[in-house]
């Protein structure tokens, strides 16, 4: 079974800068999985943001600002990266990755 690790416990960024969050997949080939990213703002329910499927297809939640989030997959390091552009107050949250094994 696959296992996920988010090595950064926290990430502190200046407003308008870029944040990159990592999710390391082990126990399964990342190219054979879909990785999903979610965020949980303080006091709010968890929300789906973006996913990258086994074939590289990216799906973004409607209503999420365009250009705000980028998702990538690096097979060499078995890592999925969530990039948050122009960090703002609304981006303060806990971000979770999740795995769907194909």
């Amino acid at each position: 079974a696959g296992h996920l690790e988010q090595p950064q416990i926290s990430s502190t960024k200046t407003l308008s800068k870029t944040a990159r969050l990592e999710c390391v997949v082990s126990g399964i080939t990342i190219s054979a999985t879909s990785v999903y990213w979610y965020r949980e703002r303080p006091g709010e329910v968890i929300q789906f943001l973006v996913s990258i499927s086994y074939d590289g297809t990216v799906r973004k939640e409607s209503g999420i600002p365009s250009g705000k989030f980028e998702v990538d997959r690096i097979p060499e390091t078995s890592t999925s990266t969530l990039t948050i552009h122009n960090v703002e107050k609304q981006d303060i949250a806990t971000y979770y990755c999740a795995l769907w094994e194909v």
């Epitope: 502190t12 407003l15 303080p42 006091g43 329910v45 705000k68 107050k89 609304q90 303060i92």
Partner: antibody, heavy 126, light 109 residues
Framework: EVQLVESGGGLVKPGGSLRLSCAAA????????MNWVRQVPGKGLEWVSS????????YYADSVKGRFTISRDNAKNSLYLQMNTLRAEDTAVYYC???????????????????WGQGTMVTVSS | EIVMTQSPGTLSLSPGERATLSCRAS???????LAWYQQKPGQAPRLLIY???SRATGIPDRFSGSGSGTDFTLTISRLEPEDFAVYYC??????????FGQGTKVDIK
């Protein structure tokens, strides 16, 4: 001195347009979310629209959605509200207001409008 | 849409008395997202309380906020002449609109 000054209000006919401006001074404008709030004279406050510091997150009240457009120019320290297809019920004093900034690096952050302009009157009448 | 209901509509009190203003949300609101404002005639509103209980800069300690979930309270421990005004609560939920209550007027008895 931290200050917000609105301009652009006036008398306009129903169906007409106006563009409100809000000039900010005394703080780093690009670090703050901004809001427009309106108030019919003698009545309560109504939130109209909000825009985040880098303009990624933009929200509108249902009553103005599709007619009003909020925008900002961080280089000019200015906030704008483009109001189209104006109706009689849009008649109000329009305030721009700064949202609370982020203090420290904590996950505990708050919302609230801590700096307000003096308001600009918009009258929609034939 | 979260509806904020304030009570009473008008509160008639004398200087030195304690004022208790209520704000009830139609659904649960995070304490981080609840604010109180004061507005005097001809003036813009002024932020009093944010995060349900934190006083804004320069606000005297006779003003205090409390509550959680759907019920919030603004208390003025001893009314000063300058405290007679209209008070509004406001919620910032997980999605707009960021609604205000209809206001409570505190006037001199």
């Amino acid at each position: 001195e931290v200050q917000l000054v609105e301009s652009g209000g006036g008398l306009v006919k129903p169906g007409g347009s106006l563009r409100l401006s809000c000039a900010a001074a005394g703080f780093t404008f690009s670090n703050y979310d901004m809001n427009w709030v309106r108030q019919v004279p003698g009545k309560g406050l109504e939130w109209v629209s909000s825009i985040s510091s880098s303009s990624s997150y933009i929200y509108y009240a249902d009553s103005v959605k599709g007619r009003f457009t909020i925008s900002r120019d961080n280089a000019k320290n200015s906030l704008y509200l483009q109001m189209n297809t104006l109706r009689a019920e849009d008649t109000a004093v329009y305030y721009c207001a700064r949202d609370l900034g982020i203090t420290g690096t904590t996950m505990d952050y708050y919302y609230g409008m801590d700096v307000w302009g003096q308001g600009t009157m918009v009258t929609v009448s034939s | 849409e979260i509806v904020m209901t304030q009570s009473p509509g008008t509160l008639s009190l004398s200087p030195g008395e304690r004022a208790t203003l209520s704000c009830r949300a139609s659904q649960s609101v995070s304490s981080s997202y609840l604010a109180w404002y004061q507005q005097k005639p001809g003036q813009a509103p002024r932020l009093l309380i944010y995060g349900a209980s934190s006083r804004a800069t320069g606000i005297p300690d006779r003003f205090s906020g409390s509550g959680s979930g759907t019920d919030f309270t603004l208390t003025i421990s001893r009314l000063e002449p300058e405290d007679f005004a209209v008070y509004y609560c406001q919620q910032y939920g997980s999605s707009p609109p960021y609604t205000f209550g209809q206001g409570t007027k505190v006037d001199i008895k």
